[in-house]
Interface confidence: low
């Protein structure tokens, strides 16, 4: 099904307008912003999210050090182009004619330049660090039941393929999740790892994507586990290009 | 054939309260939202909210939220609307319209209100 | 609330001109923007929805165009029945919220 049916809302995204429409009176979902139609049977993409969001905003030894070509979104929110499959265009442009190129998940990954800017295909991202630090505890959580948790948390909430859930680190107070998708492991169907992290994102934050869920409650072993910050590093199967300035900043 | 007929013209004193109609057919009445759509005299469009019939889930304007209230009765394929504490800026015509996407592609004839002392 | 603004007020014409109508919204609402024509005495009648799809029954002459902020219908070749009052609509959020409105009248 594509929204729930009884009251034609879309449960994986409440950015949304619905309106039983479909055919046999289906309900039909269309993200805010954009007015694309959405499958309410899966996430939504980052792409439309943040299209909609803008119409209505360190590393211990054990732990995976993010490599020289990792991306952090330091631009925060802006209005994207979406394509029709709702993905990033490779190109974004502001309202000043200022453009740049970005990657699968919209985060960029060139220096601005102006409308003569060419992006000639959009580069995925395959590779995300989740880098989680959560407040303290009694005493540090049990790896296994953390892993299992973060990872019943992806399968189930986010419906990612555990096979794309490629490693939970721990060392207290800091968490890593990496998340691994390349372009021919992912199949027709499957979330995307961009999204899924966009998702978990927000969820983080309490700003919960999903409709009427409650927000999202991480226990492990009924333990809270309460995140006081995050940093996500993106990875990209062509290293970004920036100017010798910013990677010497 | 999609219909949406609409109950007759009413007068009403400020203060009073109107409850109108809005009677469909033609297609499977719980499965589209009812819309409702005012037009002062000589002015534009306003919404006013809309309510899913099949279980009587609605959205109001926030400018008529303390003053309408959108019912449905399934069992005629009947939406109603009623708005209280009538003022003499209410007179208008009052239109219900059904959802094709969120463009509303059927329409009722209309209902003239209107609000004197 | 999301302001919509149409412009021209009133567009005077003569049948078989091209007319242009304009709508711009307060901010980018995508695609989400309706189109309607009213004549007196009648309930609107949907043009156009999600700035460009037709709609079954509307002639080919009613197109629309744009996305973001900046709408467009086009009614190609006028014919004497299309001279009436244009209204868009935007679906993006709540409230739903119309313009202003366009009269389109015989010059």
């Known amino acids: 099904h594509t929204a729930a049916q009884d009251n034609c809302t879309c449960p994986t995204n409440k950015m949304t307008v619905c309106s039983p429409d479909g055919p046999g009176g289906r309900c039909q979902c269309r993200a805010l912003g954009s007015g694309m139609a959405v499958d309410c049977s899966t996430l939504t993409s980052k792409c439309l999210l943040l299209k909609a969001r803008m119409s209505a905003p360190k590393n211990a030894r054990t732990l995976v050090r993010p490599s020289e070509h990792a991306l952090v979104d330091n631009d925060g929110l802006y209005d994207p182009d979406c394509d029709p499959e709702g993905r990033f265009k490779a190109r974004q442009c502001n309202q000043t004619s200022v453009c740049w190129c970005v990657n699968s998940v919209g985060v960029r990954r060139t220096d601005k330049g102006d409308l003569s800017l060419r992006c000639d295909e959009l580069v995925r991202t395959h590779h995300i660090l989740i880098d989680l630090r959560h407040r303290p505890t009694a005493g540090a959580f049990n790896h296994s039941d953390l892993d299992a948790e973060l990872r019943r948390l992806f399968r189930e909430r986010y419906r990612l393929h555990p096979k794309f859930v490629a490693a939970v680190h721990y060392e207290q107070p800091t968490i890593q999740i990496e998340l691994r998708q390349n372009t021919s492991q992912k199949a027709a169907g499957d979330v995307d790892i961009g999204d899924a992290a966009y998702y978990f994102e927000r969820d983080i934050k309490g700003e919960s994507l999903f409709q009427g869920r409650g927000g999202l409650d991480l226990r492990v072993r009924g333990e809270p586990l309460q995140v006081e910050r995050t940093l996500i590093y993106y990875l990209d199967e062509i290293p970004p290009k920036f100017s010798m300035k910013r990677l010497t900043a | 054939e999609v219909q949406l007929v609409q109950s007759g013209a009413e007068v009403k004193k400020p203060g009073a309260s109107v409850k109108v109609s809005c009677k469909a057919s033609g297609y499977t009445f719980t499965s589209y939202w009812i819309n409702w759509v005012r037009q002062a005299p000589g002015q534009g469009l306003e919404w006013m909210g809309n309510i899913y019939p099949s279980n009587s889930y609605t959205n109001y304007n926030q400018k008529f939220k303390d003053r309408v209230t959108m019912t449905r009765d399934t069992s005629t394929s009947t939406v109603y609307m009623e708005l209280s504490s009538l003022r003499s800026e209410d007179t208008a015509v009052y239109y219900c319209?059904?959802?094709?996407?969120?463009?509303?592609?059927?329409w009722g004839q209309g209902t003239l209100v209107t609000v004197s002392s | 609330e999301i302001v919509l603004t149409q412009s021209p007020a009133t567009l005077s014409l003569s049948p078989g001109e091209r007319a242009t109508l304009s709508c711009r919204a307060s901010q980018n609402i995508g695609t989400s923007i309706h189109w309607y024509q009213q004549k007196p005495g009648q309930a609107p009648r949907l043009l156009i929805e999600f700035a460009s799809e037709s709609i079954s029954g509307i002639p080919a002459r009613f197109s629309g165009s744009g996305s973001g902020t900046d709408f467009t219908l086009t009614i190609s070749s006028l014919e004497p029945e299309d001279f009436a009052v244009y209204y868009c609509?935007?679906?993006?959020?709540?409230?739903?919220?119309f313009g202003g409105g366009t009269k389109v009248e015989i010059k």
């Open positions: 319209s059904s959802y094709r996407s969120d463009g509303f592609a059927y």
């Open positions: 609509q935007q679906s993006n959020s709540w409230p739903f919220t």
